[in-house]
Every structure is written in structure tokens, then in C-alpha cells.
């Protein structure tokens, strides 16, 4: 019986962008300004998200879809659907509770967000440092000694590598 009733429910005919108005004999009424319904058969419309403060509007709210926000310059999105904005830092820095701080020696961050990560350790793969690391860039490892030996093939597969610190030679 319940199933039959739901099939005959007049609200199921209300399309996205409308709601089934109980106060008006269950007729389909358009969503009021600043609200939306993204699916049919809704008994209410949802309030549109408002992009205020550090949030800015990436996509306006319509009767069938919610507004989408991103962050003002100097901030970046965090969380699903950009639920938070976090302050950018410079490359070579990370955000702490006390603000942006330079990466410690031996670490780097090549982005405006995220944390400082340790330089690759070239010596773990038996390699030397080709280019030193900086606060903004990881170390670049050179080829392994085996790649440099007289019998090394002229076509070597991609040579992994890894080490912080000083220059080879």
C-alpha cells in the first residue's frame, strides 16, 4: 500500500528547481530566491551557500544547483567542496600556528601549500648528489656508480637516485 501511495504521490512530479508546496495543495512551486533543489520530488528547497570573507564565488547558485566557492588570492581550498580556506605561504615555507615559517635545513617545499618535506637521500640508492637541495627544491641525484662504469650500456633505463648535502666532486 505504501509503495502504491508513493507512486501516486504528486510530489514526485515536481522537477529540480521546484519544491512540493504542502501549503498550496502539493503543487510544484519554484524555489524562492537564494535557494535550490538539485533533484525532483523535493518537499523543500535548500538554502544556497554564500561565499563570503576569504571565500569567493566560483559558480553562482541557480534554482537547480548550489553555489560553489573558492578562495581569494593568497589562500587555497581545503576540504570537500572547498569547505575551508587556508593561507598560502611562499615556496620554501610551510604554514605553522605562528604563520609561515621557512623550511628547516634538509627540507623543502616547492608549493605554496603543504609542509616541508625532507630532501631525497641519494645515498640510500648508492648515488651521489648532482644538484644540491634548497628550501624550494629537492636534491637531484646523479646516476649510480654502476651507470658510470666502463661497461655501462649507452641506453640505460631511467636511473632512480637519492641524498641531501654536498656536491659530488
Amino acid at each position: 500500500f505504501e509503495r502504491t501511495r508513493s507512486l501516486q504521490d504528486p510530489c514526485s512530479n515536481c522537477p529540480a528547481g521546484t519544491f512540493c508546496d504542502n501549503n498550496r495543495n502539493q503543487i510544484c512551486s519554484p524555489c524562492p530566491p537564494n535557494s535550490f533543489s538539485s533533484a525532483g520530488g523535493q518537499r523543500t528547497c535548500d538554502i544556497c551557500r554564500q561565499c563570503k570573507g576569504v571565500f569567493r564565488t566560483r559558480k553562482e547558485c541557480s534554482s537547480t544547483s548550489n553555489a560553489e566557492c573558492d578562495c581569494t588570492p593568497g589562500f587555497h581550498c581545503l576540504g570537500a567542496g572547498c569547505s575551508m580556506c587556508e593561507q598560502d605561504c611562499k615556496q620554501g615555507q610551510e604554514l605553522t600556528k605562528k604563520g609561515c615559517k621557512d623550511c628547516c635545513f634538509g627540507t623543502f617545499n616547492d608549493q605554496k601549500r603543504g609542509i616541508c618535506r625532507p630532501w631525497t637521500n641519494c645515498s640510500l640508492d648508492g648515488k651521489s648528489v648532482l644538484v644540491n637541495g634548497t628550501k624550494e627544491r629537492d636534491v637531484v641525484c646523479g646516476p649510480s656508480p654502476a651507470d658510470l662504469s666502463p661497461g655501462a650500456s649507452s641506453v640505460t633505463p631511467p636511473a632512480p637516485a637519492r641524498e641531501p648535502g654536498h656536491s659530488p666532486q
Epitope: 641519494c122 640508492d125 644538484v131 627544491r137 636534491v139 641525484c141 646523479g142 636511473a159 632512480p160 637516485a161
Partner: nanobody
Framework: AVQLVESGGGLVQPGGSLRLSCAAS????????VAWYRQAPGKPRELVAV???????RYADSVKGRFTISRDNAKNTVYLQMNSLKPEDTAVYYC?????????WGQGTQVTVSS
Amino acid sequence: AVQLVESGGGLVQPGGSLRLSCAASGSIFSSYAVAWYRQAPGKPRELVAVISSEGTTRYADSVKGRFTISRDNAKNTVYLQMNSLKPEDTAVYYCFGGRSSMGTWGQGTQVTVSS
């Protein structure tokens, strides 16, 4: 993956010049450090010069003041300008592209300095 192809090698007289090119496939090449190595018969490959993604350069003592490494990121190419060449510069010259712990070799180009 980035692939590297060297060119510009050849036979040159002592005191002459050559310019080697290392051309790369792949638009991320600009983020790679690139080095030139060379290998004479029966000897290990030795580092000649390296240029970082930012353009910082470093040279082996044996080529300082004679060789210049440079890069043109718009052309995805790194160059090695070799002046005042000596017979001891004779070798196969290899390009090595590296980023963090990854590296790729080219196939090499022969440079012979002889009168």
C-alpha cells in the same frame, strides 16, 4: 617519461669548437636538472657539467673556462658549448636528465679531437 637525444658531436681539430645539444621530449623537462657526462674508451663516465632547473651551473675542473652549459626551456633543449678543445676531450658525451631520485640517459654522441 622524458626521452633525451644528443646531437652535435663530430671530428674537430685541437683548439676548435663544437656545440652539443640534448633535446628532450616532454613539457616537464624544465623541471629537470641536466648534466653532461663523457666516457673515453675503457674509462668510467665522468661528470662534465650540470645545470639545475633554475639555471645554476657547475663544471668539472678539467673543463672550467672552456665549456659552457646552458638551457632553452622553450625548446626543451640543453646545450654544451665546447671551446679550446683538446685531444683529451675525445669521448662519447652523454646527456643525463634528473629530477629528485629519477634519472634518464640519452644514447650519446661521439666527440673526437684530433689533428
